[in-house]
């Protein structure tokens, strides 16, 4: 056959040769020839390549900068990048998690629907009728109004989304 124009999986075409790609964790040192195999070398400390490749340089592991609120969630290997996450009380600003911001708090009248994680912010929801929140918090849900009836009391002041009801004693029937 003539020299190939297409190559098998995990190979690449160069100078009419099908050369083996370097395996994950290794970089290309020299292309194969008619008489020699592709030469690859392992990535150095703090470097990685995560695919079969013909890269001449490995990628640097991501740096989890504590000044940006980041910390290492999973240490990188020669085949995987470092995964960063945010310090407690903070979350990533993007999927790549390159910096962190403080979890938002839900204002009075709103409660926490979903508590924030290292990668997602707090989700707030308005307190529906019958519930209230009187604090700014990243953890507190909307609380139900107090049930005056179960305490043998009556509502003296109606509740709002920011305040609880005020209960008081029932008026005594006069003789």
């Amino acid at each position: 056959p003539e020299p190939p124009t297409a190559c098998r999986e995990k190979q690449y075409l160069i100078n009419s040769q099908c050369c083996s790609l370097c395996q994950p964790g290794q970089k290309l040192v020299s292309d194969c020839t008619e008489f020699t195999e592709t030469e690859c070398l392992p990535c150095g400390e703090s470097e990685f390549l995560d695919t079969w490749n013909r890269e001449t340089h490995c990628h640097q592991h991501k740096y989890c900068d504590p000044n940006l609120g980041l910390r290492v969630q999973q240490k990188g290997t020669s085949e995987t990048d470092t995964i960063c996450t945010c310090e407690e009380g903070w979350h990533c600003t993007s999927e790549a998690c390159e910096s962190c911001v403080l979890h938002r708090s839900c204002s009075p009248g709103f409660g926490v629907k979903q508590i924030a994680t290292g990668v997602s912010d707090t989700i707030c929801e308005p307190c529906p009728v019958g519930f209230f929140s009187n604090v700014s918090s990243a953890f507190e849900k909307c609380h139900p109004w107090t049930s005056c009836e179960t305490k043998d009391l009556v509502v003296q002041q109606a509740g709002t989304n920011k305040t609880d009801v005020v209960c008081g004693p029932q008026d005594r029937l006069r003789a």
Epitope: P1, S30, D31, E34, F35, T36, E37, T38
Partner: antibody, heavy 112, light 112 residues
Framework: DIQLQQSGPGLVKPSQSLSLTCSVT?????????WNWIRQFPGNKLEWMGY???????EYTPSLKNRVSITRDTSMNQFFLRLTSVTPEDTATYYC?????WGQGTSVTVSS | DAVMTQNPLSLPVSLGDEASISCRSS???????????LNWFFQKPGQSPQLLIY???NRFSGVPDRFSGSGSGTDFTLKISRVEAEDLGVYFC?????????FGGGTTLEIK
Amino acid sequence: DIQLQQSGPGLVKPSQSLSLTCSVTGYSITTNYNWNWIRQFPGNKLEWMGYIRYDGTSEYTPSLKNRVSITRDTSMNQFFLRLTSVTPEDTATYYCARLDYWGQGTSVTVSS
Amino acid sequence: DAVMTQNPLSLPVSLGDEASISCRSSQSLENSNGNTFLNWFFQKPGQSPQLLIYRVSNRFSGVPDRFSGSGSGTDFTLKISRVEAEDLGVYFCLQVTHVPYTFGGGTTLEIK
């Protein structure tokens, strides 16, 4: 076009050293490939003597390891063969080769 | 070392005939990536060897398609489909999978 041009003496005395030069044009010997020395004895038998790689490391055939060395001059794009303590059994035609391209050959006779 | 055994030593043919040359290795020439570095060369008297086939079956540039290589592991074959006058000379196999590289003893293609 890639060319390999050989130079060196055709007659060497026994016990002396044989030195040959291979000058490469059209391709840098530091880019890739193994740069070989091969000899052919009377009667056509071919023997691979060794190579110097593009990165400067070398390999030799075990039977000649103590007597052979292959070096290079990257600034001149040349590589060299040195064979010490020659005997009449080293009489052969010596080739430098990238294997897809060959030098013209140098006929070397070892005789006093 | 991988010992390369070529057969026949001499192959008398008529022009236009098919010629077949065998090359056997004492060990497998397939490497860990599944590649096999077995080459065929042709040499005319007074000339340097020239590459015909590399990696078992790949024709080198400019080599006519009447030349074909096949085989795997330890057994390899060079076929010339219709012998022409310019094909007469010596054919060698060479393995470069293992160091030291080793040649077959050669097969002389001659007129019957």
